[in-house]
C-alpha cells in the first residue's frame, strides 16, 4: 500500500537510457507519443516531473518475498499526463488522468549500478520499463538470470 496520497518529494529531471538516448514526448493527434532517440546537441531535453511516494510492502500479502519500505514514483512529462503501464499490451503509455492516480501509474524505483535507476510496475512485480525497438515497453526480468539488463537502465539528470 502507498503510505498517504501526497508525494514525499518531487523533482524535475530528464530521462535517458543507459546508452544516452533521450526519452522524448510528442503531442500527435491529441495524444502523446513516447520516443527513444538520439538528440541533436542543441536540442533541449524533455523534463519529467518525478513524484516520490513511500510505500509499505508486506510480503505476507504479496507472496513475492519482498517486504519493508520502498520508494515509488510517478512520472509526468506534462500537466495531467502520466506514464502508465499497460500490462496486457506490454507497453508504456501516456494517459491523461485525475488524482488519485491508478496503480498503473506507480513504479517502484530501483537503485542500479552505473548511476542508473529502473522502474518496476507496481501492478506487475518483476516487470520493468525498458527500451525495445526505440520505444518504451514493459520487460519481464528474471532475478535468477544474469541479464546484464542494460535495456531497463535509465539515467536521471536534473
Amino acid at each position: 500500500s502507498i503510505t498517504g496520497i501526497s508525494p514525499i518529494t518531487e523533482s524535475l529531471a530528464s530521462l535517458s537510457t543507459y546508452n544516452d538516448q533521450s526519452i522524448t514526448f510528442a503531442l500527435e493527434d491529441e495524444s502523446y507519443e513516447i520516443y527513444v532517440e538520439d538528440l541533436k546537441k542543441d536540442k533541449k531535453k524533455d523534463k519529467v516531473l518525478l513524484s516520490y511516494y513511500e510505500s509499505q510492502h508486506p510480503s505476507s500479502e504479496s507472496g513475492d518475498g519482498v517486504d519493508g519500505k520502498m520508494l515509488m514514483v510517478t512520472l509526468s512529462p506534462t500537466k495531467d499526463f502520466w506514464l502508465q503501464a499497460n500490462n496486457k499490451e506490454h507497453s508504456v503509455e501516456l494517459h491523461k488522468c485525475e488524482k488519485p492516480l491508478p496503480d498503473q501509474a506507480f513504479f517502484v524505483l530501483h537503485n542500479r549500478s552505473f548511476n542508473c535507476v529502473s522502474f518496476e510496475c507496481k501492478t506487475d512485480p518483476g516487470v520493468f520499463i525498458g527500451v525495445k525497438d526505440n520505444h518504451l515497453a514493459l520487460i519481464k526480468v528474471d532475478y535468477s538470470e544474469n541479464l546484464g539488463s542494460e535495456n531497463i537502465l535509465f539515467k536521471l539528470s536534473e
Epitope: 518525478l50 513511500e54 519482498v66 530501483h110 537503485n111 544474469n146
Partner: antibody
Framework: EVKLEESGGGLVQPGGSMKLSCVAS????????MNWVRQSPEKGLEWVAE??????????DYAESVKGRFTISRDDSKNSVYLQMNNLRAEDTGIYYC????????????WGAGTTVTVSS | DIVLTQSPASLAVSLGQRATISCRAS??????????MNWFQQKPGQSPKLLIY???NQGSGVPARFSGSGSGTDFSLNIHPLEEDDAAMYFC?????????FGGGTKLEIK
C-alpha cells in the same frame, strides 16, 4: 520473519585470515543488495563492503581501508553472503554486521545481530 | 568521502520533552531530488535499527514520535514526546554513494 544471521567471528592473529558468513531467511534473497558494516569503540560504525545483484554482474564495492584484503561474495542458492578477510590487522577488530538494503536498494533496512572479530596476538 | 558530523555527542532530556539531534554532511547527500540521509537507533548489546530513511520517512514499525527533516547538507532527528525506552545511541548515515558513511553518534539519556 525477515532474519540475517552472521557466523564465523572469533580470535585471529595479525596477518591471519577469517571468513564470515551470513544466512538470510524470510525474503527473496536474490532481489537485494547486501552489505557488511563493522563497529568498534575507536572508529564507530564503518561501512566495509557491498555486493549487488546477479542481473548487474554482482558489482562489488569496498571501503578503502579493506580494499585488496577483503572479498565479499554471495551464493543466492544458499541465501548467503560472505566476507573473506585476509591479512587482518588490529584495527579490523570489531562487531561485523550483515545488512540487507530495502527493496529497490536505497537504504540499509535489516541488520543482523553481528559477529565479533578480534585481531590480536 | 562525505563526512557526517553529528551534534551533540550526548544529551540528557526529560521524559515527555523533545530531543533534537543534528547531522551535517560535508557535501550534499541529495540525488534525484531525494535526500539520502538515514537515522538509526542502537541500544546496548543490540544491532542498529532503521528509524528514518530518505531524511523524513519512518522505517517499518517506527513510532510517529520519531521524525526527521532536512535536505542537502543539514538534517535533524526529533523525538517527541520522549519515552523511557528512547535512551540509546543515535546515528545518521548517508546512502547517496559509496563509501557510505556514518556520523559519530549521539548518546541520548533520559533525565
Amino acid at each position: 520473519e525477515v532474519k540475517l544471521e552472521e557466523s564465523g567471528g572469533g580470535l585471529v592473529q595479525p596477518g591471519g585470515s577469517m571468513k564470515l558468513s551470513c544466512v538470510a531467511s524470510g525474503f527473496t534473497f536474490n532481489k537485494f543488495w547486501m552489505n557488511w558494516v563493522r563497529q568498534s569503540p575507536e572508529k564507530g560504525l564503518e561501512w566495509v563492503a557491498e555486493i549487488r545483484l546477479n542481473s548487474i554482474n554482482y558489482v562489488k564495492d569496498y571501503a578503502e581501508s579493506v580494499k585488496g584484503r577483503f572479498t565479499i561474495s554471495r551464493d543466492d542458492s544458499k541465501n548467503s553472503v560472505y566476507l573473506q578477510m585476509n591479512n587482518l590487522r588490529a584495527e579490523d577488530t570489531g562487531i561485523y554486521y550483515c545488512i540487507r538494503r530495502n527493496y529497490g536498494n536505497w537504504f540499509f533496512e535489516i541488520w543482523g545481530a553481528g559477529t565479533t572479530v578480534t585481531v590480536s596476538s | 568521502d562525505i563526512v557526517l558530523t553529528q551534534s551533540p555527542a550526548s544529551l540528557a532530556v526529560s521524559l515527555g520533552q523533545r530531543a533534537t539531534i543534528s547531522c551535517r554532511a560535508s557535501e550534499s547527500v541529495d540525488r534525484y531530488g531525494i535526500s539520502f540521509m538515514n537515522w538509526f537507533q542502537q541500544k546496548p548489546g543490540q544491532s542498529p535499527k532503521l528509524l528514518i530513511y530518505a531524511a523524513s520517512n519512518q522505517g517499518s514499525g517506527v513510532p510517529a514520535r520519531f521524525s526527521g527533516s532536512g535536505s542537502g547538507t543539514d538534517f535533524s532527528l526529533n523525538i517527541h514526546p520522549l519515552e523511557e525506552d528512547d535512551a540509546a545511541m543515535y546515528f545518521c548515515q548517508h546512502s547517496k554513494e559509496v563509501p557510505y558513511t556514518f556520523g559519530g553518534g549521539t548518546k541520548l539519556e533520559i533525565k
